[in-house]
């Protein structure tokens, strides 16, 4: 004999000893019908704010308040936004690796320093993790260039830099 709880819709709960579909109480939800209980809705407070409010069929979704970003599945925690010279990774904010920079506050990824030699120019000011290199005026006489291979932290990928 089929249990009538099997016919219950999401947003309801049903107990086998009294197989009647009942609506989820306030601040609870059930995304699958026929369950014996509804789940308690997530509350977004403190560093969290509501991205999506709870309904009888779906849990609430949280996001982080201004100046913070989510970490972990379903935004389980909030971390302060990255500073210039850093980029966001799963592990949180990491300093830009050698040969890259990020001049943005809170967003963006580390990007490579400009290769001045592509435009036939010399490096006037070397780059930092927060600032790109500053290229000088075009070089008139080209001396042989030396290629320095800079390996990004932790990996075999080389960043090709030209020193003139």
């Amino acid at each position: 004999v089929q249990n009538s709880c099997d016919n219950c819709q999401p947003g309801t709960f049903c107990r086998k000893y009294n197989p009647v579909c009942k609506s989820c109480p306030p601040s609870t939800f059930s995304s699958i019908g026929g369950q014996p209980n509804c789940n308690i809705c997530r509350v977004c407070a403190g560093y969290f704010r509501f991205k999506k409010f709870c309904s009888s069929t779906h849990n609430a979704e949280c996001e982080c308040i201004e100046g913070f970003h989510c970490l972990g599945p379903q935004c389980t925690r909030c971390e302060k936004d990255c500073r210039p010279g850093q980029e966001l990774t799963k592990q949180g904010c990491k300093t830009c690796s050698l040969g890259t920079f990020n001049d943005q506050n809170g967003t963006g990824v580390c990007r490579p320093w400009t290769n001045c030699s592509l435009d036939g120019r010399s490096v006037l000011k070397t780059g930092t993790t927060e600032k790109d290199v500053v290229c000088g005026p075009p070089v008139v006489s080209f001396s042989p260039s030396t290629t320095i291979s800079v390996t990004p932290e932790g990996g075999p990928g080389g960043h090709s830099l030209q020193v003139l």
Partner: antibody
Framework: EVQLVESGGGLVQPGGSLRLSCAAS????????IYWVRQAPGKGLEWIGN????????FYGEKFMGRATFSADTSKNTAYLQMNSLRAEDTAVYYC??????????????WGQGTLVTVSS | SVELTQPPSVSVSPGQTARITCKLN????????VHWYQQKPGQAPVTMIY?????PDGIPERFSGSSDSSSNSAFLTISGVQAEDEADYYC??????????FGGGTKLTVL
């Protein structure tokens, strides 16, 4: 709609070179990394390197240093891969892909259709 | 350096659940985002799961991503497998934020 369209593949003699194009549209070309990835017949995906079109900055996989060169023409929203001294083992489908600006360890959200390069005499 | 290991093949009957493993050789799986791509013959890869467990628009709910710290592995789970799911699946992470690393790929066969 974001699109990456590749061209330039074909038959190349051993020792020869290739120049592949990756034409981007539907987004700000200078604000996203373009990665180059290849796939030999029946094999997995292999990273060649990547370029930041905004300033021409490049990174190369160790295996491809000195043999591959990336460039970008921002007026044409196109990235290029030049590869020299080609060998039979360079026969592969070459893909360009875009990485979002969310995090440093993010996925590739758009891929080109791929272009087949065959190195053979 | 970081390496990702996948089984070469997984077979499953239609309607069953397929689970593809991506094992990290060093470090902690919880420290790395893992992304999953599906590739059918003659086509470019398509993102199925990104940032561990997120599904792009248009990808069926049958596809889900997870990880397990005890086995240091990430998983792509396909519930209610359909014939059209037959393809190669690749996991993807990073050795550094510059250097992407791919698993060797898993061929999913729907019996």
């Amino acid at each position: 709609e974001v699109q990456l369209v590749e061209s330039g593949g074909g038959l190349v003699q051993p020792g020869g070179s290739l120049r592949l194009s990756c034409a981007a549209s539907g987004y700000t070309f200078t604000s996203y990394y373009i990665y180059w990835v290849r796939q030999a017949p029946g094999k997995g995906l292999e990273w060649i390197g990547n370029i930041w079109p905004g300033n021409g900055g490049t990174f190369y996989g160790e295996k491809f240093m000195g043999r591959a060169t990336f460039s970008a023409d921002t007026s044409k929203n196109t990235a290029y891969l030049q590869m020299n001294s080609l060998r039979a083992e360079d026969t592969a489908v070459y893909y360009c892909a875009r990485r979002p600006d969310y995090s440093g360890d993010d996925y590739f959200d758009y891929w080109g259709q791929g272009t087949l390069v065959t190195v053979s005499s | 350096s970081v390496e990702l290991t996948q089984p070469p093949s997984v077979s499953v009957s239609p309607g069953q659940t397929a689970r593809i493993t991506c094992k990290l050789n060093s470090g902690n799986i919880g420290s790395y985002y893992v992304h999953w791509y599906q590739q059918k013959p003659g086509q470019a890869p398509v993102t199925m799961i990104y940032r561990d467990d997120k599904r792009p628009d248009g990808i069926p709910e049958r596809f889900s991503g997870s990880s397990d710290s005890s086995s240091n592995s990430a998983f792509l789970t396909i519930s209610g497998v359909q014939a059209e799911d037959e393809a190669d699946y690749y996991c993807h992470s990073y050795d550094s934020t510059i250097t992407p690393v791919f698993g060797g790929g898993t061929k999913l066969t729907v019996l």
